[in-house]
């Protein structure tokens, strides 16, 4: 058959939950401390909460059935009677009472024809303000008759026909009734919730609803123009040209900021947005949802997209509607011919209308922002330059912040890119120019996107002119080639000598993409003497082992994921892993990762890696290449305190410092 509607699916779930109590029993969730009841969907059933409030499960006859004394469940179908009597069956006795008062309506409800009645519950009538009720029953009950006729449709309409966004023609002056049928199974009629649906009568069907509904006369734009509380909004809508849309056809939800909401915004920010047509349009579009959303449809958190493109979390807490977890809706379900309005008393400023400073204020990068401000870079973050700010997380600075000196200023300038970027358009190998004049490289990995050694830790925040990238560490631009990096660090004097001896200097100085696992002097010292002497005594063996320490692409620690098999220049693969924030290569921890170079990255290791296919095989007849004089001279392996005259004094000192 045809696909079941969300309402029918929820009802089916309630039947399943109730069937152990007998036939045609439905499980109903009742919000504790209220009379609000809901047929239950899976999520609510397990959470036992509606709008954050605890519920109790009760078991009732499913719509259209009744109990039989002495029998289990609800085995009997309700006897069919006319509409008037069916109002009593569903418990809408107040509607019956008011129907009697009109005199004309009861004969219709009892007579021939086919009608649908959306009957307000007794509680719905009781909750009407006294003056509204008084006006209905005065004027020889004409208003009451009109009100009741507005709740009626001149044909039978069952829930499977109630489609989201449809309008029904009522029996009062052919006025429209708005129907919304939400994915969670809730059905609303002019934002009143269907409580009990599809109660058949001989001459139609009765649906019990939780409010008295009234005719809708104005569109959204007209409501904005009528209400004094929307004076600022009115001006903003006019300035942005959105009034045409808000008075046209369609179904929208306007989260309408009151004058008070605008007043809460610092005037500098407000004036900037109001004076910027693009920012203003984005601001207003961020208050408009693409479809009508009645408050009754919200029973739990729901992500909705605004016309501007931002996702809002609409939820509820008891009777209060919330947006992004805050109860800022002061008046809900103001119906318009083209949607629904909820008054809000806080402005929802989208990222697209914010400066970099404002974006950063809501992110976990406040420490970095303070540093940019102290370094005199604040004007870049609040101006109209197209920029991307690479802001490290606060946690990066848990051990303190650097002093603001020329070096720090330059470092920070290299965290600002001279273009407004979006991470989804970045590609591997792309270079980005910074305010500091550096070219930064983009590395795209399976599960991360990195700029030099620093990887993006949160979704971009794209502002009016600038984009904020939240980064997982301070970015260190490369200062030279891999060879420059190694030569500039005395921990690698032996490695440098080994590289020179093995003829790999040129490789590590030229353009390229290398990952170098760089053994420290201590790593060489830790080799068993035999392996050390094999390494030093055979240029081919040395080159082979050193090439095994060089990966053929750039792999920064943020790009590792769990495990990466990195091909080395020697041919074998290196197993690089990341666990508990510690990088390991071939299961050996890396002492210091991510020293960036223009042609690669250096990871410091404290052991010499051995290629699996080339682990030393002892052969007594092996003849090695000639001795490697450069390496021998620079090496710390010698424990000698006296040296033959062949060594220059500079090497003598080096050996002395490093000897056993």
């Amino acid at each position: 058959g045809p696909a079941k509607s969300p309402y029918q699916l929820v009802l089916q779930h309630s039947r399943l939950r109730g069937r152990q109590h007998g036939p045609n029993v439905c499980a109903v969730q009742k919000v504790i401390g209220t009379n609000r009841k809901y047929f239950t969907n899976c999520k609510q059933w397990y959470q036992r909460k509606i709008c954050g409030k605890s519920t109790v499960i009760s078991y009732e006859c499913c719509p259209g059935y009744e109990k039989v004394p002495g029998e289990k469940g609800c085995p009997a179908a309700l006897p069919l009677s006319n509409l008037y009597e069916t109002l009593g069956v569903v418990g809408s006795t107040t509607t019956q009472l008011y129907t009697d008062r009109t005199e004309k309506l009861r004969p219709e409800m009892e007579g021939p024809g086919s009608f649908t009645i959306f009957a307000p519950s007794n509680e719905a009538w009781a909750s009407l303000p006294a003056e509204v009720l008084d006006s209905l029953v005065s004027n020889v009950n004409i208003e009451l008759l009109n009100a009741l006729r507005y709740h009626m449709v001149g044909r039978r309409v069952l829930t499977d026909e109630l489609k989201h966004g449809m309008t029904l023609t009522s029996m009062y002056q052919n006025s429209n009734i708005q129907i919304h049928h939400y994915p969670n199974g809730i059905v609303t009629v002019n934002c009143a919730r269907l409580l009990k649906a599809d109660h058949h009568a001989t001459n139609g069907v009765v649906h019990l609803i939780d409010k008295v509904i009234s005719t809708i006369t104005n569109n959204i734009q007209q409501i904005i123009e009528i209400e004094d509380t929307f004076e600022t909004l009115r001006a903003a809508v006019a300035a942005s040209g959105l009034n045409t849309m808000l008075e046209g056809n369609g179904q929208y939800t306007l989260l309408a900021p009151t004058n008070e909401a605008f007043e809460k915004i610092p005037s500098e920010t407000l004036n900037r947005i109001l004076g910027d047509p693009e920012a203003l349009r984005d601001l207003l579009n961020n208050h408009i949802l693409k479809s009508a959303m009645c408050a009754e449809a919200i029973v739990a958190g729901l992500s909705v997209e605004t016309l501007e493109g931002t996702t809002l979390e609409v939820g509820c807490s008891g009777d209060m509607l919330t947006i992004n977890g805050k109860a800022i809706i002061s008046n809900k379900d103001i119906l318009a011919t083209n949607g629904v309005i909820h008054y809000i008393d806080e402005l929802l400023i989208p990222d697209s209308a914010k400066t970099l400073f404002e974006l950063a204020a809501e992110s976990d990068v406040s420490t970095a922002i303070d540093l940019f401000r102290q370094a005199g870079l604040g004007n870049h973050l609040s101006g109209s330059e197209r920029l991307t700010l690479l802001a490290p997380l606060n946690s990066v600075f848990k051990d303190g912040t650097p002093p603001i000196d020329a070096h720090t200023r330059n470092l920070l300038r290299n965290h600002i890119i001279k273009d407004q970027l979006a991470s989804k358009y970045l590609y591997h190998g792309q270079t980005l120019e910074t305010l500091g004049g550096k070219k930064l490289r983009v590395f795209v990995y399976r599960n991360s996107l990195c700029i030099e050694n620093s990887c993006i830790a949160a979704h971009d925040k794209r502002g009016r002119y600038g984009t904020l990238f939240t980064m997982d560490r301070v970015l260190t631009p490369p200062m030279g080639t891999v060879m420059d990096v190694l030569k500039g660090d005395n921990r690698f004097s032996m490695l440098v000598a080994a590289i020179q001896s093995a003829g790999l200097t040129e490789t590590l100085n030229r353009e390229g993409v290398y990952t170098v696992f760089a053994p420290t002097n201590e790593a060489f010292r830790a080799l068993p003497p035999r392996e050390r002497s094999r390494l030093l005594g055979d240029a081919k063996e040395l080159a082979n082992i050193l090439k095994y320490h060089i990966g053929d692409e750039i792999l920064v620690s943020g790009g590792i994921g769990a495990l990466v098999r990195l091909k080395s220049l020697q041919g074998d693969k290196l197993e690089v892993s990341l666990k508990n924030n510690v990088v390991s290569v071939n299961k050996e921890p890396v002492a210091e990762p991510d020293i960036m170079a223009t042609n690669g990255v250096v990871h410091v290791i404290t052991n010499v890696l051995q290629p699996p296919a080339n682990r030393p095989q002892e052969r007594g007849d092996e003849l090695a290449d000639s001795a490697l004089e450069i390496f021998k001279q620079a090496s710390a392996f010698s424990r000698a305190s006296q040296r033959s005259v062949r060594l220059a004094p500079v090497y003598q000192k080096l050996l002395e410092r490093m000897k056993h």
Partner: antibody, heavy 120, light 113 residues
């Protein structure tokens, strides 16, 4: 046939000096690591010093560091141990030893030893 | 430094019987990169220089009879002589070449029972 013949041992007073020599034959001397190992009377073996095939890498036991110097002369196929500031505890038989190959290794071939006695 | 400890200090065994002696290192002699144990065994007879028997903990030197075998890994090693001959009675030393300074055990004296 590999042959290592030590010489230069003898009686010396504490603080005195001695130079031990080892004449090597039957193999290409310049292709091997060489070692001095000693054995005090009635005691076990103790490694003293190492020199690499090319004479560049040199290692000493802490007990002799700064007093003894190992050297080699490949032209003469000879290994030397210059011993200065001798002490009574340096009294031992000193063995000249060849490694297994051109790399630092275990002690493959031993000379018959030369006795050094330090006594006043 | 790595300390080598041999046991027993003296071992009395009859000719033709099996002799087993142990050597323990204060730290592992197994180099993970090549899975080799950096340990050698030597034999020394009175008035003679020591002679290499075993290297890499279990590899017999050329010319050493098959009755000599080495085993063990990491820190625990054993030298076994399967059927003692009269010429086997001597002092046996183990030695590590995993780290400088190279060190020997204090020796096990194998005597005729």
């Amino acid at each position: 046939q590999v042959q290592l013949v030590e010489s230069g041992g003898g009686l010396v007073k504490p603080g005195g000096s001695l130079r031990l020599s080892c004449a090597a034959s039957g193999f290409t001397f310049s292709d091997y690591y060489m070692y001095w190992i000693r054995q005090a009377p009635g005691k076990g073996l103790e490694w003293v010093a190492t020199i690499s095939d090319g004479g560049i890498y040199i290692y000493y036991a802490d007990s002799v560091k700064g007093r003894f110097t190992i050297s080699r002369d490949s032209a003469k196929n000879s290994l030397y141990l210059q011993m200065n500031s001798l002490r009574a505890e340096d009294t031992a038989v000193y063995y000249c030893v060849r490694g297994w190959d051109r790399y630092d290794s275990w002690f493959a071939c031993w000379g018959q030893g030369t006795t050094v006695t330090v006594s006043s | 430094e790595i300390v080598m400890t041999q046991s027993p200090a003296t071992l009395s065994v009859s000719p033709g019987e099996r002799a087993t002696m142990s050597c323990r290192a204060s730290q592992s002699l197994l180099y993970s990169s090549n899975q080799k144990n950096y340990l050698a065994w030597y034999q020394q007879k009175p008035g003679q220089a020591p002679r290499l028997l075993i290297y890499w903990a279990s590899t017999r030197e050329t010319g050493i009879p098959a009755r000599f075998s080495g085993s063990g890994s990491g820190t625990e090693f054993t030298l076994t002589i399967s059927s003692l001959q009269s010429e086997d009675f001597a002092v046996y030393y183990c030695q590590q070449y995993y780290r400088y300074p190279y060190t020997f055990g204090q020796g096990t004296k194998l005597e005729i029972k």
